[in-house]
């Protein structure tokens, strides 16, 4: 998948974009909104009918280097008398984003964009039943 | 980040960290093809917490379409198909990163950009305090 | 800790109006919904109208929809609820409540009664 160039459409390129080499792109890595605190419902994860775990995942070549996966806990929901129901779902909730990978081939360094899916939390979803003959 | 151990005899001159600004491949390293939340799965409508996704459409953000949920209502949807409004519809938010166009237009020129989306909802039970 | 101060309750006609209010201070940040529930002796409280933080959207029990409208002030957190119309079946207990998707505080509750 490439990135798709700036349509004609929207604008013209300007004058002032830096000249970067043929099939590459340059990309800044300083993070804008690197600092902004988003303030997440406190707890969502325990207090879910579908509860979900977190596990961070570590790569040095990678970048970010943390990435965070959240599991659902349960096969099924928890009911309002906080058992599991099995008649309902627990099933993930997915996000693409991008990182930074990097390659060593021999004594060269590369970069290369790569699409994560991270999984977000869980959600409690009536299944579809078939009944098989 | 700290970088693999490699050959010994490469010259050490590279950073441990990552540096400022990087030269990438065009090509996105990418076995998730399928952006679309509507056709990856339908359980924005089979969830008790139902949620619709909403484009968000910016042509100098790579993604360029960005989809974005919705919770559909305060509560739950209950057994009997009704909404529970003892229970809450939360949306779960995640951080991810998207390339910005910078300067901006610039076919071949990016800087990483941290956004909050909302990816879908889950059903809470809350806490009840009564307030003297 | 949050406080909740719900005003506006009383006594009217059939098909008068009344405007209930709920103000909250206090640790009231990160606001899921803001809205109310109302209760009659032996029964269950039961939800009115409901007002999401981030967007406005709006929800209505299905026998108030068209008579009673929930609004709100963010700067001031918080939501009035104009009620039209009045019928005898409107007597209650109503109830102030403010959610921050884990936790839900109730107010003490403010009487409405609508005779005919």
């Known amino acids: 998948r490439k990135i798709p160039k700036v349509g004609h459409t929207f604008f013209q390129k300007p004058e002032s974009c830096p000249p970067v080499p043929g099939g590459s792109m340059k990309l800044d890595i300083g993070i804008i909104n690197e600092n902004q605190r988003v303030s997440m419902s406190r707890n969502i994860e325990s207090r879910s009918t579908s509860p979900w775990n977190y596990t961070v995942t570590w790569d040095p070549n990678r970048y970010p280097s943390e990435v965070v996966q959240a599991q659902c806990r349960n096969l099924g929901c928890i009911n309002a008398q906080g058992k599991e129901d099995i008649s309902m779902n627990s099933v993930p909730i997915q996000q693409e984003t991008l990182v930074v990978r990097r390659k060593h081939q021999g004594c060269s360094v590369s970069f290369q964009l790569e699409k994560v899916l991270v999984t977000v939390g869980c959600t409690c979803v009536t299944p579809v039943i078939h009944h098989v003959q | 980040g700290i970088t693999i151990p490699r050959n010994p005899g490469c010259p050490n001159s590279e950073d441990k960290n990552f540096p400022r600004t990087v030269m990438v491949n065009l090509n996105i390293h990418n076995r998730n093809t399928n952006t679309n939340p509507k056709r990856s799965s339908d359980y924005y409508n089979r969830s008790t917490s139902p949620w619709n996704l909403h484009r968000n459409e910016d042509p100098e953000r790579y993604p360029s379409v960005i989809w974005e949920a919705k919770c559909r209502h305060l509560g739950c949807i209950n057994a009997d198909g009704n909404v529970d409004y003892h229970m809450n519809s939360v949306p779960i938010q995640q951080e991810i990163l998207v390339l910005r166009r910078e300067p901006p237009h610039c076919p071949n020129s990016f800087r990483l950009e941290k956004i909050l989306v909302s990816v879908g909802c889950t059903c809470v039970t809350p806490i009840v305090h009564h307030v003297a | 800790e949050v406080q909740l101060v719900e005003s506006g309750g009383g006594s009217v006609q059939a098909g008068d109006s009344l405007r209930l209010s709920c103000a909250a201070s206090?640790?009231?940040?990160?606001?899921?919904?803001f809205g109310w529930f109302r209760q009659t002796p032996g029964k269950e409280r039961e939800f009115v109208a409901g007002i999401r933080w981030s967007d406005a959207y709006t929800e209505y029990a299905n026998s108030v929809k068209g008579r009673f409208t929930i609004s709100r002030d963010n700067a001031k957190n918080t939501v009035d609820l104009q009620m039209d119309s009045l019928k005898p079946e409107d007597t209650a207990v109503y109830y102030c409540?403010?959610?921050?998707?884990?936790?839900?505080?109730w107010g003490q509750g403010t009487q409405v009664t609508v005779s005919s």
């Open positions: 206090g640790r009231a940040n990160s606001i899921n919904w």
């Open positions: 409540v403010l959610d921050l998707s884990t936790v839900r505080y």
